[in-house]
Interface confidence: medium
């Protein structure tokens, strides 16, 4: 099978992953897009959705995932904050148009997370100035289950990666689980 | 194609306070964020803040906090720039701007506030 | 705050000229930059979105570049109407900053 490309995001504990996903404006703009992880021989694991009709530019929080979608400018903005090293592994956005099965955005996301976090600043870490917490009220999407057994192009070397469940809530006792900004456009 | 059309020039003393206003073309702000972005004479671009309308909660530049109050609403509009105690150098042209993490697509046609004794 | 830091403040350019500034974040931003053309009396226009997107009716002689830190704005054949002051502007975190401006003038 096909060797998707990958590209490589290599942080610490305690940071953030932020990545955005490209998508053709007008055909794609309101379709529901979702965050997936891709374990060793299973079928792409759901993590996170948008809202359906997706909403522009409204964050939708599941966990340590905050999703964003820029219709205006055809980009989905993913973030996973207080990353753990159990979160490492291969990371795919996809949009969902039912019938049709899922369409992927390249690149996949092939995340390792190391122990022990980073002294300098760095676009991945929090800070405890301008920060934006998202409320208790951000949206959460219902995803559809399904998702393509075509995606499943070749397996990923084994992860353990468990992300949080949808049901948990970020934790904003501790300055690295704080949300940062822009959850707006 | 979006207009965000801001209300007319000011003229304004020393001390006190001034209010503009940001219309966007058909109808409200909705999802959509407000910031306000000011240029002084011969100066740079200068981010006061800015709004996301669903949450309701503004960010300011530390500079201007504490004499900046931005508002806008998701089902009303327009939106708003309220600077108070203002000084000569608050002379300037003031835009509001739609926009956040991708950057400003839309921009009103500016403000000019005097400010002058 | 993040500071970005633009160089150079001014050049001097002819029509057909590859026109390059380059702009610097006081820490890493990720992809979080846009670039904007400004000319006296008018709006801030939006040429670069997200470090490297072209925004919808921008000439492709506009590119961005860059992730981090570094942020490149190339003009790759400068036009008449090219003439104008340009800005990043960092849409990492709060508060969003610009960096000073860079002026292109007519050589």
């Known amino acids: 099978a096909t060797k998707l490309t990958e590209e490589k995001y290599e942080l610490k504990e305690g940071q953030t992953l932020d990545v955005k996903c490209d998508y053709t404006l007008e055909k794609f703009a309101s379709s529901q897009k979702a965050w997936q992880i891709i374990r060793d021989g299973e079928m792409p694991k759901t993590l996170a959705c948008t809202e359906r009709p997706s909403k522009n530019s409204h964050p939708v929080q599941v966990g340590r995932i905050i999703l964003e979608d820029y219709h205006d400018h055809g980009l989905l903005r993913v973030r996973m904050v207080n990353l753990q090293v159990e979160d490492s592994g291969l990371y795919q956005c996809v949009i969902y148009q039912p019938p049709k099965e899922p369409h992927m955005l390249f690149d996949r996301i092939r995340l390792v997370v190391t122990k022990g976090f980073s002294g300098t600043p760095g676009s991945n870490e929090n800070s405890t100035q301008n920060v934006y917490k998202i409320p208790p009220t951000t949206t959460k999407a219902l995803c559809p289950l399904y998702t393509s057994p075509r995606t499943v192009t070749q397996a990923p070397p084994k992860s353990t990666a468990d992300v949080s469940t949808p049901d948990s809530e970020i934790n904003l006792t501790n300055v690295t689980d704080i949300i940062r900004v822009p959850v707006f456009n | 194609q979006v207009q965000l059309v801001q209300s007319g020039a000011e003229v304004k003393k020393p001390g006190s306070s001034v209010k503009v206003s940001c219309n966007p073309s058909?109808?409200?702000?909705?999802?959509?964020?407000i910031s306000w972005v000011r240029q002084a004479p011969g100066q740079g671009l200068e981010w006061m803040g800015g709004?996301?309308?669903?949450?309701?909660?503004?960010n300011y530049a530390q500079k201007f906090q504490g004499r900046v109050t931005i508002t806008a609403d998701e089902s009303t509009s327009p939106g708003y720039l309220e600077l108070s105690s203002l000084r000569s150098e608050d002379t300037a042209v003031y835009y509001c701007?739609?926009?956040?993490?991708?950057?400003?697509?839309?921009w009103g046609q500016g403000t000019l506030v005097t400010v002058s004794s | 705050d993040i500071q970005m830091t633009q160089s150079p403040s001014s050049v001097s350019a002819s029509v057909g000229d590859r026109v390059t500034i380059t702009c610097r974040a006081s820490?890493?931003?990720?992809?979080?930059l846009a670039w904007y053309q400004h000319k006296p009396g008018k709006a801030p226009k939006l040429l670069i979105y997200?470090?490297?997107s072209l925004q919808s009716g921008v000439p492709s002689r506009f590119s961005g570049s860059g992730s981090g830190t570094d942020f490149t704005l190339t003009i790759s054949s400068l036009q008449p109407e090219d003439f104008a002051t340009y800005y990043c502007?960092?849409?990492?975190?709060?508060?969003?900053?610009f960096g000073g401006g860079t002026k292109v003038e007519i050589k």
């Open positions: 701007a739609r926009g956040g993490a991708v950057g400003f697509a839309y």
């Open positions: 058909g109808g409200t702000f909705s999802t959509y964020a």
């Open positions: 709004i996301n309308p669903i949450f309701g909660t503004a």
């Open positions: 820490q890493g931003i990720s992809s979080w």
């Open positions: 997200a470090a490297s």
């Open positions: 502007q960092q849409a990492n975190s709060f508060p969003f900053t």
